[in-house]
């Protein structure tokens, strides 16, 4: 190896200057008594190298690139060798930004997987390898005093979410949770969340069903639908409120919302609808009056309202 490049910093802020030095050892100067060292960034030759012979006979060229505007590039020093460039050494330069503060950190407690799933927005592209770590600790109070640390949660590459398993959680106790972002140019931390996992529980929705007509029950009136729902069993003991939404299957009507309904209503007669019309219905629930997150909307149930009763003047007796 005849040459060696050293740089002021291989990773810099995008747009910052960078200084590099290329030294050619004395035993290589047979190539040319006064070799002219050339610089190249990517495919482009870079003027402005200052060259000198050092006391030990080595040749040194120093160049300052005033603005590194490439997020990744190879800087090489070379000599003219006949009609071609002889590369002596090259280094990879990276430029980017320190990580922005991760924002919009939020968490959901999933009772099915028994884990607390937290997600965040990482902020603008840094152009550098940036690692994210979900950090947390247990706290008996309002997270001002830190209890036991919980094992760091490291998301898979490129993901902005991480799951803390049940064995690291304490239900009905607060946890301090934040995201730390780190790359070669710096570290940033999101604001800390302080939460009890049960206060961010996201339930599964009930399953909507058609109400089985019972012999003694009156059939639904025109423009009415009778429906029932089966609560999600694992959330059965959690007090909830629910809401229905419905819209005609045909046409461009938007959803109409009905609620709040107590989970325990279990059955409901929905009226004020168009007669002889097919409707799509969905239900969702939330832990209430304690804090929680709305469930997703349930799978749709499709029901048709009965036709308007005939207006003939026959003497029908309705029992």
């Amino acid at each position: 190896e005849c040459g060696h490049i050293s740089v002021s910093a291989p990773i810099v802020h995008l747009g910052d200057p960078i200084t590099a030095s290329c030294i050619i050892k004395q035993n290589c100067s047979h190539l040319d008594p006064e070799p002219q060292i050339l610089w190249r960034l990517g495919a482009e030759l870079q003027p402005g190298g200052r060259q000198q012979r050092l006391s030990d006979g080595t040749q040194e060229s120093i160049i300052t690139l005033p603005h590194l505007n490439h997020t990744q590039a190879f800087l090489s020093c070379a000599l003219n060798w006949g009609n071609s460039l002889q590369i002596l050494d090259q280094v990879e330069l990276r430029a980017g930004y320190p990580p922005a503060i991760p924002h919009n950190l939020s968490c959901l407690m999933n009772l099915t997987t028994s884990s607390l799933i937290c997600q965040w927005e990482p902020g603008p592209e840094t152009h550098l390898p940036t690692s994210f770590t979900l950090k947390s600790f247990k706290s008996r109070g309002n997270c001002q005093t830190q209890g036991d640390s919980i094992l760091d949660c490291v998301p898979k590459d490129g993901q902005s979410h991480c799951s803390i398993p049940r064995k690291h959680l304490l239900l009905y106790q607060n946890m301090g949770i934040w995201v730390q972002a780190e790359n070669a140019l710096g570290t940033s931390m999101s604001p800390q969340l302080c939460l009890d996992p049960m206060d961010v529980v996201k339930l599964e929705p009930p399953m909507l069903r058609t109400m089985d007509p019972s012999p003694e029950a009156a059939p639904p009136q025109a423009g009415c639908l009778q429906l029932s729902w089966e609560p999600w069993q694992p959330g059965l003991h959690i007090n909830q409120k629910c809401e229905l939404r419905h819209k005609p299957q045909r046409g461009e009507a938007s959803w109409a919302l009905v609620g709040p309904l107590p989970l325990e209503a279990l059955q409901y007669e929905l009226c004020g609808l168009l007669p002889a019309t097919a409707y799509t219905l969905q239900i969702r629930c939330i832990r209430w009056p304690l804090p929680g997150h709305w469930s997703d909307w349930s799978p749709s149930l499709e029901l048709r309202t009965t036709e308007r009763a005939p207006t003939h003047h026959h003497h029908h007796h309705h029992h």
């Epitope: 009772l111 099915t112 997987t113 028994s114 049940r166 064995k167 239900l171 049960m198 609560p231 069993q233 694992p234 059965l236 003991h237 959690i238 007090n239 107590p262 325990e264 209503a265 279990l266 009056p289």
Partner: antibody
């Protein structure tokens, strides 16, 4: 402090009826599911029935379905178990319990003994 | 119905011993598994809920683990007041079944 106090146990003949009560204090009764668990002499625990916070959902063990009725009066902070058509195998200590959100029996009364014998 | 099988049904141990009791569900119950302690003539007492959460006031020598079908209650260092019968219970769905119990006796 949560307190659950059962009453109404005693000796009853087979086929007879009994009504157990459980007076609750120290918590907001109307926000919690409640339940009854029994324990026959020298045996393990057996869940009997539970009731949702407003009384709309009332599951029962197969062994008591159709004979026992669970109910609650949130204005009186009281849980009830109406037991009809009692059998010798219903002999047990009956415990009233407060349920947590994950179905756990968080707090228990001291129990009341029901003896079904001729 | 989900059946709960506890083992052993009884065990003899000395003060200071590490004791492990297992509970198996006949089908997966996620983490909906609770452990109770009962002393003669007394009402049961909740120790662990949702498989691994220690109920308030319960000493930290008690711990729970497992998920799905296999669960464990561990007493890290048995104390004189821990000699009792222990029950597991599933609370995923009704009927809420208890295990048959494990009696921990003095060796």
């Amino acid at each position: 402090e949560v307190q659950l106090l059962e009453s109404g146990g005693g000796l009853v003949q087979p086929g007879g009826s009994l009504r157990l009560s459980c007076a609750a204090s120290g918590f907001t009764f109307s926000l919690y599911w409640m339940g009854w668990v029994r324990q026959a002499p020298g045996k393990g625990l057996e869940w009997v029935s539970s009731i949702s916070s407003s009384g709309g959902v009332t599951p029962y063990a197969d062994s008591v379905k159709g004979r026992f009725t669970i109910s609650r009066d949130n204005s009186k902070n009281t849980l009830y178990l109406q037991m009809n058509s009692l059998r010798a195998e219903d002999t047990a200590v009956y415990y009233c319990a407060k349920l947590g959100e994950l179905g756990q029996f968080m707090d228990w009364g001291q129990g009341t003994l029901v003896t079904v014998s001729s | 119905d989900i059946q709960m099988t506890q083992s052993p049904s009884s065990l003899s141990a000395s003060v200071g011993d590490r004791v492990t009791i297992t509970c198996r569900a006949s089908q997966g119950i996620s983490s909906y598994l609770n452990w109770y302690q009962q002393k003669p003539g007394k009402a049961p007492k909740l120790l662990i809920y949702y498989a691994s959460n220690l109920q308030n006031g319960v000493p930290s020598r008690f711990s729970g683990s497992g998920s799905g079908t296999d669960f464990t209650l561990t007493i890290s260092s048995l104390q004189p007041e821990d000699f009792a019968t222990y029950y597991c219970q599933q609370s995923l769905e009704y009927p809420q079944m208890f295990g048959g119990g494990t009696k921990v006796e003095i060796k």
